[in-house]
Amino acid sequence: EPPGPEQRVVRRAAEVPGPEPSQQEQVAFGSGDTVELSCHPPGGAPTGPTVWAKDGTGLVASHRILVGPQRLQVLNASHEDAGVYSCQHRLTRRVLCHFSVRVTDAPSSGDDEDGEDVAEDTGAPYWTRPERMDKKLLAVPAANTVRFRCPAAGNPTPSISWLKNGKEFRGEHRIGGIKLRHQQWSLVMESVVPSDRGNYTCVVENKFGSIRQTYTLDVLERSPHRPILQAGLPANQTAILGSDVEFHCKVYSDAQPHIQWLKHVEVNGSKVGPDGTPYVTVLKTAGANTTDKELEVLSLHNVTFEDAGEYTCLAGNSIGFSHHSAWLVVLPAEEELMETDEAGSVYAG
């Protein structure tokens, strides 16, 4: 149904920046406005099928929410309509447009760029750094400290409370308690254990409305096992001659891990020894002042063709060893390619 005679329509549009990342528009509407968000590709190029989401959850059309491929309308906006709206490509889930929407008490002037302090508005809570509210899953090893934060504002200043799996969460609910730092909008749990797994929701509210954010915590159990290496790391790399390259290796281990980076080499034309063990040279290993974090990265500077080949991240602890490998391909510099092309050489892929 179209907006009634008393309702003002306030439009906000963002251009889809093609292959560039989407920009988060921070916009304000007045209570009772019809919110209209538009997401248009440059030059009218088709975006393909899209879906609209609010705070990460898909929006379903209703008598009040009108969902179109490149346009979203919310009739008679209320404080509950505040949040982060995104238009995404239905198949790839690539974010095409991003809006952080606040709904204030007064009808909107239609101009959110006057540079005035936002807290002067009387209104429902809103995230003060909405772009930071998208890290929803946290996986940490047992015994680590976990901190969830939900910085928000509103007028009057909103209160913050926490739920675990939908129920009120208080210090007595866990051994070791929790630290609630209301001014920092944070919940801190020290020395987490598997029973701390679950969904943690911050609820920020004042008399004009409430917003919430849910984080999922997974606690990786400490059990005696060899190091676990993150899948997909290190990743294969292709580099131009003379450029810099980094290989990354994420290691999870309860017992103190020993990390080494190896490069596979040939000895007398053979890659493996008589016993089948590959020939390798150690490029990086623990030293007196090296941290595990530093060992998780192998940096190669000013690469040459000799640097091409197979690299292995090897991690061991008292229980055993794990390793992942990746390949480096080194391509000639562009000028070199052009010179050889002019000389009539042919390169086969």
């Epitope: 988060q24 003060t128 504002a153």
Partner: antibody, heavy 118, light 107 residues
Framework: EVQLQQSGPDLVKPGASVKISCKAS????????MNWVKQSHGKSLEWIGD????????TYNQKFKDKATLTVDKSSSTAYMELRSLTSEDSAVYYC???????????WGQGTTLTVSS | DIVMTQSHKFMSTSVGDRVSITCKAS??????VAWYQQKPGQSPQLLIY???TRHTGVPDRFTGSGSGTDYILTIRSVQAEDLALYYC?????????FGAGTKLELK
């Protein structure tokens, strides 16, 4: 060791565009947001905007919305800032700085000096 | 935008002194304040975030305090290497904003 290595100084003519790079090393680039900051000669610091390297989502200071475009190339762990329609007012030192969630800029690049002059 | 005001452009001190640099926000920033040190020709360095949390490796003579709109960076016993520019920043709400800076110099 965490390092943010920025591209070298640049002298450009008014009206032109420039692209400054910031190569991150010593950490996993997708674990931190990348911010960009302007410091005009003898002046304070101005936040230009930030980018989430995971999904490329950017947030800009309105003042720089039509001036700067932030991008990131995950494969090379490099963040970029393009500045367009340059004037003498854009002459400054530009820094990239990483931030974990909400906790301040813990590592900064060495700065890139941009001079706009005809 | 939130305006961060550092009322003293310069502060004179002697080695061994205790000095307090102040910063006032134009609205409540809920302890979302960071402090940076910048020496000539160098990039800023993070000292304190969330008003009072010391960044890794920062000497314990640097402490931060405050809430609401008023924040203080205290250097307990100034060393020669502490003579520098100090900026406050609110990292609570976008757009993030910095103070104009306070230069700490020798008397």
């Amino acid at each position: 060791e965490v390092q943010l290595q920025q591209s070298g100084p640049d002298l450009v003519k008014p009206g032109a565009s420039v692209k400054i790079s910031c190569k991150a090393s010593g950490y996993t680039v997708t674990d931190y947001y990348m911010n960009w900051v302007k410091q005009s000669h003898g002046k304070s610091l101005e936040w230009i905007g930030d980018i989430n390297p995971n999904n490329g989502v950017t947030t800009y200071n309105q003042k720089f919305k039509d001036k700067a475009t932030l991008t990131v190339d995950k494969s090379s762990s490099t963040a970029y800032m393009e500045l367009r329609s340059l004037t003498s007012e854009d002459s400054a030192v530009y820094y990239c700085a990483r931030e974990e969630d909400f906790d301040g800029f813990d590592y900064w690049g060495q700065g890139t000096t941009l001079t706009v002059s005809s | 935008d939130i305006v961060m005001t550092q009322s003293h452009k310069f502060m004179s001190t002697s080695v061994g002194d205790r000095v307090s640099i102040t910063c006032k926000a134009s609205q409540d920033v809920s302890t979302g304040v960071a402090w940076y040190q910048q020496k000539p020709g160098q990039s800023p360095q993070l000292l304190i975030y969330w008003a009072s949390t010391r960044h890794t490796g920062v000497p314990d003579r640097f402490t931060g305090s405050g809430s609401g709109t008023d924040y203080i960076l205290t250097i307990r016993s100034v060393q020669a290497e502490d003579l520098a520019l100090y900026y406050c920043q609110q990292h609570y709400s976008t757009p993030l904003t910095f103070g104009a800076g306070t230069k700490l110099e020798l008397k």
